[in-house]
Interface confidence: low
């Protein structure tokens, strides 16, 4: 036997391996060591060393391959911005110490998105979000240059791509390349450059993982039914083919160790409990692995959707089960997942293409046998028809989360395996199992109510109200004056949001009829609440016959609505439900939601109109960029406004403007559409941004919508972001979680 192979394990001398200003600990039975530095410091030039077969420790080499005699703890710096487009940052410095701040501002004509001020944190990362200066000129908004990265590409047209790079020695996490997609979103996920000493804090992981996971859960399509909503939770009843499968994959190799394995089990128990709190009943698959995988729970088992039973199976798994086979064969483990996903005789069962698959992999490091596991991810994507059709990539049907635990984690490998989705993080690197347990503890402790707003159950035989479950029809009967028809939107179990001008002060509650869900019966009204600043006659003296500023009202119902497939709330801006619907982190501010929903550009939106007794969605563009001024100026063509000298007298900052022929010929609203929601459809969710108020041209004379309308036919809607204090006050008891 060669001498190198006969050497006992862990026989490298510890002489001279000390680190100046810190300490070290041995890993893998003395086969590796990790340098540990105090908070705010990092080990230079490397964090870990391995014991080589020659009996010496791996060399201390810097990122540019220079050899160093002794390791030392150095102060953590945050990277400087290599580039900042269309603006300036200050102060400029070659590096930044912990607690240093930088601030960003944009050149004229550009709007800042993200964080204007950022602080260098103790883990070497900047606080807040990437600062971006954008003028809204592209089809997609500027994707930005996360600090520390370099971006190639500055065209943001449909299907344009940008690529990102890191400086030598840093590892790119996230997407190296992002492509501008239909609908204005970027493919993949925002990149960042990671140094080996960087870890995600438990709070960061809990926030990012939870934000992404709730989106996956809330996006589950229930094809065949959904029971009435329980208090604060919507139960999603899975169709027979199962709408969601979660595969828990746990590394049980010898490098993990018994206590870490127990810790990982605790994490997964917490996760199962968390998912159950959403009222979702996914099927679970459970795999542990070392040299070989072991399947403990198959998704095909009858009890795989019983959270208690799955938890019991998980608790009974013993670390010793993999004792004699201690390699790390991640590929084989993922092949076990693939085997659970695939179907006998290659014949897909009914509904297979509506099932979402979530893989959660916990590992302490490198796969050291079996080959590259990425090939299995490719096979899984192939099996599920993901990424194969440019028009319908089906990316929503697979989420792969990878939790890397400890210093030996190979960041490149775990990043390659994890999914990459816009505004989401699927790859996490935590310091140790204690930190990971903390992640799942924080996550389980998060106890916001989960009202799934803006959800639409798509049915083969779905009615209009399955597709628009928030839509309310309002009519006001006025003796000897006929009746007024309006629309509204269900925003909570007791409230419908509509336009104030649908009512007069003389209208009695009993003369107001509200129906939802396509039901024949009318709902009893407790009270109509007008915005206090609404006054249609407010500018009569100034020669303005009708003034629609603050044209919003809330109808309070006497009885609580019973949510179901055809009655559900729409999402309101600056609420927790909208944060989740948009897959934003829980720390998202109202301003960040506004930037997401109403960026300074043409925004694709829709309203719902009734034509020949059918509800139809009409696609329009909110002119919020360079076309905003011309859109608002067309208000002068409205009857009674021709003498208005300054159009801002009638078009106040409360209004959003749609209509006209650019970028596309927008359909116009009709009288009966007033009070209905102006909606942004994002990530399969519907968020109300406006209330339909008034139009320049009556395009629906004689109950028929005219085909040819003038270019100045514009519509004006109350911007909900502008009436938030009132909404927040009136809806404070509705558990909407206003930000």
């Amino acid at each position: 036997t060669p001498w190198s192979l006969a050497r006992p394990q862990g026989s490298c001398s510890l002489e001279g391996v000390e680190i100046k200003g810190g300490s070290f600990r041995l890993l893998q039975e003395g086969q590796a060591l990790e340098y540990v530095c105090p908070s705010g410091f990092y080990p230079y030039p490397v964090q870990t060393r391995t014991c080589r077969s020659t009996g010496s420790w791996s060399t201390l080499k810097t990122q540019d391959q220079k050899t160093v005699r002794k390791a030392e703890c150095r102060a953590i710096h945050c990277p400087r911005p290599h580039d900042f487009e269309n603006g300036e940052y200050w102060p400029r410095s070659p590096y930044y110490n912990v607690s240093d701040e930088i601030s960003f501002h944009c050149y004229d004509g550009y709007t800042l998105r993200g964080s204007a001020n950022r602080t260098c944190q103790v883990n070497g990362r900047w606080s807040g979000q990437t600062a971006i200066c954008d003028n809204g000129a592209g089809y997609c908004s500027n994707p930005g240059i996360p600090i520390g990265t370099r971006k190639v590409g500055s065209q943001y047209r449909l299907e344009d791509s940008v690529t990102y790079h890191c400086s030598r020695g840093l590892t790119l996490r996230g997407s190296q390349r992002r492509t501008c997609q239909e609908g204005g979103s970027w493919s993949g996920t925002e990149p960042s450059c990671q140094d080996s000493f960087m870890y995600d804090t438990p709070q960061e992981v809990a926030e990012a993982f939870l934000s992404s996971l709730t989106e996956t859960i809330e996006g589950v399509d229930a094809e065949d039914g959904h029971g009435p909503g329980e208090q604060q939770k919507r139960k999603i009843v899975l169709d027979p083919s199962g709408s969601m499968n979660i595969y828990l994959v746990l590394d049980g190799s010898d490098s993990i160790g018994a206590s870490n394995f127990t810790g990982a089990k605790k994490c997964l128990v917490n996760l199962i409990e968390k998912v159950a709190s959403y009222g979702v009943k996914p099927r679970y698959g459970l795999v542990t692995y070392a040299t070989y995988p072991k399947i403990w729970v198959k998704v095909s088992e009858a009890d795989s959707s019983n959270a208690d039973w799955v938890t019991k199976q998980l608790n009974e798994i013993n670390y010793e089960d993999h004792k004699l086979k201690s390699g790390t064969n991640t590929k084989k483990a993922l092949q076990a997942v693939y085997s659970m996903m695939s179907w006998p005789d290659d014949v897909p069962p009914e509904g297979w293409n509506r099932t979402r698959h979530v893989i959660i992999l916990m590992t302490d490091g490198l796969h050291n046998m079996g080959g590259d596991p990425i090939t299995v991810i490719d096979e899984i994507r192939d099996l599920l028809y993901i990424g194969k059709d440019r028009k319908n990539p089906r990316e929503d049907y697979l989420d792969v989360y990878v939790f890397g635990v400890g210093p030996l984690v190979n960041q490149v490998n775990i990043n390659a395996l994890a999914s990459k989705k816009d505004n989401e993080q699927h790859v996490f690197k935590v310091k140790d199992m204690e930190n990971l347990e903390d992640v799942f503890y924080q996550m389980i402790d998060e106890s916001q109510s989960l009202s799934l707003c803006g959800m639409v159950w798509e049915h083969r035989k779905g009615t209009d109200y399955h597709k628009q479950p928030w839509q309310a029809k309002i009519s006001v009967i006025r003796p000897s004056k006929g009746h007024e028809s309006c629309m509204g939107a269900v925003v909570s179990e007791y409230f419908v949001l509509t336009a104030a001008h649908c009512f007069t002060v003389d209208d009695k509650e009993h003369s107001i009829k509200v129906s939802v869900g396509g039901e024949k019966r009318d709902l009893e009204i407790e009270v109509v609440l007008f915005h206090p600043n609404y006054n249609i006659n407010g500018k009569k003296e100034a020669g303005i016959p009708e003034f629609y500023d603050y044209d919003v009202a809330l109808i309070k119902l006497k009885n609580k609505l019973k949510y179901g497939q055809t009655i559900r709330p729409i999402c309101l801006p600056c609420t927790e439900g909208t944060t989740r619907a948009l897959r934003l982190p829980p720390t998202t501010t109202c301003q960040q939601q506004k930037e997401e929903l109403l960026p300074a550009q043409d925004i694709k939106a829709l309203f719902v109109s009734e034509e020949e007794k059918k509800l139809t969605r009409k696609e329009v563009y909110i002119k919020n960029g360079d076309k905003k001024g011309s859109c608002e100026r067309d208000a002068q063509y409205a009857p009674g406004y021709d003498k208005v000298k300054d159009i801002s007298e009638v078009v106040t900052p409360r209004f959003l403007c749609t209509g006209g022929v650019s970028p596309y010929a927008d359909p116009n609203t009709c009288r009966g559409d007033s009070g209905g929601p102006l909606i942004v459809h994002k990530r399969s969710r519907f968020i109300q941004v406006g209330v339909i108020s008034w139009g320049v041209v009556d395009v629906c004379k004689n109950q028929k919508r005219q085909k040819q309308v003038p270019a100045h036919a514009r519509d004006f809607h109350i911007n909900l972001f502008q009436v938030l204090p009132w909404l927040k006050e009136k809806l404070q008891d509705e558990d909407l979680g206003f930000l």
Partner: antibody
């Protein structure tokens, strides 16, 4: 063994029509987008058309748009190219090629079938 | 006329290293992965490199691909007589919304 076998080529007069077929075997045909690529005598490769795995989306080169139609029958594991209003410049060897999953490239090619447009 | 430029010919002696270039624009090579094909005389093309630098199984590691900016190149080291063939580069082109091929390079092993 993964195989693509083209047929249907031959001599046709300008303005005439021809239908090429490509029989697939050895893989799950319905999971792959498919392409037609041609090569005029002594010239380079020219992409002609692509059809998505389910047949719902079709893409054509400008030179054949409106004249050629790509289609597929997943139950028969067969790809088709219907060529109408043929011109002399359409003379070429026509290859059918399978598109890879994760790149706009072609990982399996047929042996080709010659189409000659001449009076 | 192809939107991608390849030298019409290249040559080398056995054992030598040769490089074939392919120049495009931001709408094709600049923003998309490049694939390379080998076409031996009288046969159908064969995929040689995909996604700029990945080799399908069965392709010797003498063949390697790279990309920088709006150019890509194929390198063949340890040239052999059986490498004599036509080589084509192929990215996707965003502005044409289609696959595009380079004009092809005829490699002669002297």
């Amino acid at each position: 063994e993964v195989q693509l076998l083209e047929s249907g080529g031959g001599l046709v007069q300008p303005g005439g029509s021809l239908r090429l077929s490509c029989a697939a075997s050895g893989f799950t045909f319905s999971k792959h987008s498919m392409n037609w690529v041609r090569q005029a005598p002594g010239k380079g490769l020219e992409w002609v058309a692509t059809v998505s795995y389910d047949g719902n989306y079709k893409y054509y080169a400008d030179s054949v748009k409106g004249r050629f139609t790509i289609s597929r029958d997943n139950s028969k594991n067969t790809l088709y190219l219907q060529m109408n209003s043929l011109r002399a410049e359409d003379t070429a060897v026509y290859y059918c090629a399978r598109e890879g999953y994760y790149y706009y490239g072609m990982d399996v090619w047929g042996q080709g079938t010659l189409v000659t447009v001449s009076s | 006329q192809s939107v991608l430029t390849q030298p019409p010919s290249a040559s080398g002696t056995p054992g030598q290293r040769v490089t074939i270039s392919c120049t495009g624009s931001s709408s094709n090579i600049g923003n998309n992965a490049v694939n390379w094909y080998q076409q031996l005389p009288g046969t159908a093309p064969k995929l040689l490199i995909y996604n700029n630098n990945q080799r399908p199984s069965g392709v010797p590691d003498r063949f390697s691909g790279s990309k920088s900016g709006t150019s890509a190149s194929l390198a063949i080291s340890g040239l052999r007589s059986e490498d004599e063939a036509d080589y084509y580069c192929q990215p996707y082109d965003d502005s044409l919304s289609s696959v595009v091929f380079g004009g092809g390079t005829k490699l002669t092993v002297l």
